[in-house]
């Protein structure tokens, strides 16, 4: 892939191995775990990143209340099945034949079942709410400066089109970033909001996926923005299907 440099590395994904054996003898970078060639000029899909991770040696300034249908990724890491395009397969199963349905960001959206469980389609996550709490600072950040810096970050670092950053909310010390992207809005070549959110999450945790870049150094007017807690809520185009047992737990 052309973005893989002459020295044959992948700037956008350190969880790859690159060698000069691609078409035309060009550099080709394969994701660890799956072996699929990745496009190093853009973000790698979350599914391939999770698979690589599992294989590695190891407008109103009010806060948004997540919808009753919002999902949080409580299940943690798993080794996912990815489709030929590197997206999550709608049905995921573990080694013991326990299966469940996931959304486009790989978060479980049904109760767990057995191999007979059917997941007819991959349901798109069209709204992501990233809820951050920053460490104490001398004073509150200026909201418009914070808004501009976070929008710049998603545009420049994650290559996410600005139209998909719907809003940035701030009530010290809580920051909320809303990403919205309907199926109809996403054009070929557009970064997926789920992939951008995953890269951001890993950056915030100090586990950058970018090759050779320093970690994320977020500053607002020169003042460091240090995050001490992150919660991410995922809203799907079709509400999830959990039993009442789970909902009342």
């Amino acid at each position: 892939h052309t973005a893989a440099q002459d020295n044959c590395t992948c700037p956008t994904n350190k969880m790859t191995v690159c060698s000069p054996d691609g078409p035309g003898g060009r550099c080709q970078c394969r994701a660890l775990g799956s072996g699929m060639a990745v496009d190093c000029s853009t973000l790698t899909s979350k599914c391939l990143l999770l698979k690589a991770r599992m294989s590695a040696p190891k407008n109103a300034r009010t806060l948004v209340r997540p919808s009753e249908h919002a999902l949080v990724d409580n299940d943690g890491l798993y080794d996912p099945d990815c489709d030929p395009e590197g997206r999550f397969k709608a049905r995921q199963c573990n080694q013991t034949s326990v299966c469940w349905c996931v959304n486009s960001v790989g978060v479980r959206r049904t109760d767990k079942g057995d191999l007979s469980l059917r997941c007819d389609e991959l349901v798109r996550t069209h709204h992501i709410l990233i809820d951050l709490r920053h460490r104490p600072t001398a004073g509150a950040f200026n909201h418009s400066d914070l808004d501009a810096e976070l929008r710049r970050l998603f545009r420049e670092r994650y290559r996410l089109h600005p139209k998909f950053v719907a809003a940035v909310h701030y009530e010290q010390p809580t920051i909320q970033i809303e990403l919205r992207q309907n199926t109809s809005q996403k054009a070929a070549g557009d970064v997926d909001i789920g992939d951008a959110a995953y890269y951001f999450e890993r950056d915030i945790k100090g586990e950058s996926l970018f090759q050779g870049r320093g970690g994320l150094d977020l500053r607002v007017r020169g003042e460091p923005l240090q995050v001490e807690r992150t919660l991410i809520y995922y809203l799907d185009e079709i509400p999830p299907k959990f039993s009442m047992k789970r909902l009342t737990a």
Partner: antibody, heavy 115, light 107 residues
Amino acid sequence: QVQLQQSGAELVRPGTSVKISCKASGYTFTNYWLGWVKQRPGHGLEWIGNIFPGGGYTNYNEKFKGKAILTADTSSSTAYMQLSSLTSEDSGVYFCAREGVMDYWGQGTTLTVSS
Amino acid sequence: DILLTQSPAILSVSPGERVSFSCRASQNIGTSIHWYQQRTNGFPRLLIKYASESISGIPSRFSGSGSGTDFTLSINSVESEDIADYYCQQSYSWPFTFGSGTKLEIK
């Protein structure tokens, strides 16, 4: 020119282990994947797994997990495949090849497992 | 795992004829297919890479085409030295897989 030179034929007893070598020359050993392929008489080609000597990364065909262990010594540009708990089913010819396009192949190592 | 299906199992042709080998993948693999020739008691030799890219030192009578799931290797004028087994292999994702092969015989 690129060459892959494999170790000689092996005749071993069932239940034992064997280690086959593949010495690379003519290219930068640490820059390419090195794969291993099995062929039984009258059968087709079966991919066993591969190793990236530059980082020690390995991948295995599920069928050969627990059977084959791939290693590489970058100082001598040599890849190794150890096969353990050998049975007659493991008899065949084993090839090493530079990947992902298998553009250069070793001459093959014939393994015979017999009591 | 990606399954590669080669057909037919055996091809019998006369010298000078054009011959085509088919390889079908169980999913879309773009152009990540490669073709090999293996003569009796020899090691496989790369003929075509990435579906249609020619290889230095391989006679120009060998060509490849296809993308997605259907691929073809062609020999435009078969010679007696082409008697061999022909295999396709995918490098789209691990585990890499080979087709079951097609044996070329000369009438």
